[in-house]
């Protein structure tokens, strides 16, 4: 969550409605929206905690 992490990557959409789901009742095929990297290549958008939440439903 620092501005130095800003890079040119595809838009990352924040997921809605987080609850503590029971594992067996919750199945979603998440697709990764950007390539693996670490630290300086991290996503930075104006969405909440976008640097930690990168998977789109």
């Amino acid at each position: 969550p620092i501005s130095a992490f800003a890079v040119d990557i595809p838009e990352i959409h924040e997921r809605e409605g987080y609850e503590d789901e029971i594992d067996d009742e919750y199945e979603v095929d998440w697709s990764n929206s950007s390539s693996a990297t670490s630290g300086s290549g991290a996503p930075s958008t104006d969405k909440e905690k976008s640097w930690l939440y990168t998977l789109d439903p």
């Epitope: 503590d20 029971i22 930075s44 976008s50 640097w51 939440y53």
Partner: antibody, heavy 120, light 112 residues
Framework: EVQLVESGGDLVKPGGSLKLSCAAS????????MSWVRQTPEKRLEWVAS????????YYPDNVKGRFTISRDSAKKSLYLQMSHLKSEDTAMYYC?????????????WGTGTTVTVSS | DVLMTQTPLSLPVSLGDQASISCRSS???????????LEWYLQKPGQSPKLLIY???NRFSGVPDRFSGSGSGTDFTLKISRVEAEDLGVYYC?????????FGGGTKLEIK
């Protein structure tokens, strides 16, 4: 019930390596970012590492960067912390923590911790 | 790094009193997305820390309404309106706006 159970803590010599594990249950593991937080013998809390929900992005403070590696295995619902080139100042209780989600707190669930002692 | 300074180090209170803990950051912890990721945790004796407050003033699920958080920019406060025995322990503030994330040194709430 949401639960995090750490294991792998041990007494290790300076320069040694150790891998901590955290078994998660009671929530959809792949939906949440995860972190390791440690508590020094002086009771100070220090953030150690974080990993994004899908595992693609990792974050570390400078004092562990290059020595520690956080990773996750969604199939096993497990979080890991590989620690190498350990120093005496890494001696601490290590907690596995769950993030609350994009709009919530960073560490909304904590494990009971596992003790790492670095000493010759 | 953002230094988080808590005062007082120790806070002796009588049960039923109001308690106030201050946390000051060495720089603004307003994130570029507009949010302030300031949190409060309580560690009771022999237990792991627990989340109380997130984003300055939001109570975590199950946290009694006698706990309230306030502040902005660099100055933040946790207030406990009527201290109960179960509130005793060490309180830590935390900022998650700038890497490295950092905790305050802790404030021990104890019986006077």
């Amino acid at each position: 019930e949401v639960q995090l159970v750490e294991s792998g803590g041990d007494l290790v010599k300076p320069g040694g390596s150790l891998k901590l594990s955290c078994a998660a249950s009671g929530f959809t593991f792949s939906n949440y970012a995860m972190s390791w937080v440690r508590q020094t013998p002086e009771k100070r809390l220090e953030w150690v590492a974080s990993i994004s929900d899908g595992g693609s992005y990792t974050y570390y403070p400078d004092n562990v960067k290059g020595r520690f590696t956080i990773s996750r295995d969604s199939a096993k619902k497990s979080l890991y912390l590989q620690m190498s080139h350990l120093k005496s100042e890494d001696t601490a209780m290590y907690y596995c923590t769950k993030d609350g989600g994009p709009r919530e707190g960073y560490f909304d669930v904590w494990g009971t911790g596992t003790t790492v002692t670095v000493s010759s | 790094d953002v230094l988080m300074t808590q005062t007082p180090l120790s806070l002796p209170v009588s049960l039923g009193d109001q308690a106030s803990i201050s946390c000051r950051s060495s720089q603004s912890i307003v994130h570029s997305n507009g949010n302030t990721y300031l949190e409060w945790y309580l560690q009771k004796p022999g237990q792991s820390p627990k989340l109380l407050i997130y984003k300055v003033s939001n109570r975590f699920s199950g946290v009694p309404d006698r706990f309230s958080g306030s502040g902005s920019g660099t100055d933040f406060t946790l207030k406990i309106s009527r201290v109960e025995a179960e509130d005793l322990g060490v309180y830590y503030c935390f900022q998650g706006s700038h890497v490295p994330y950092t905790f305050g040194g802790g404030t021990k709430l104890e019986i006077k």
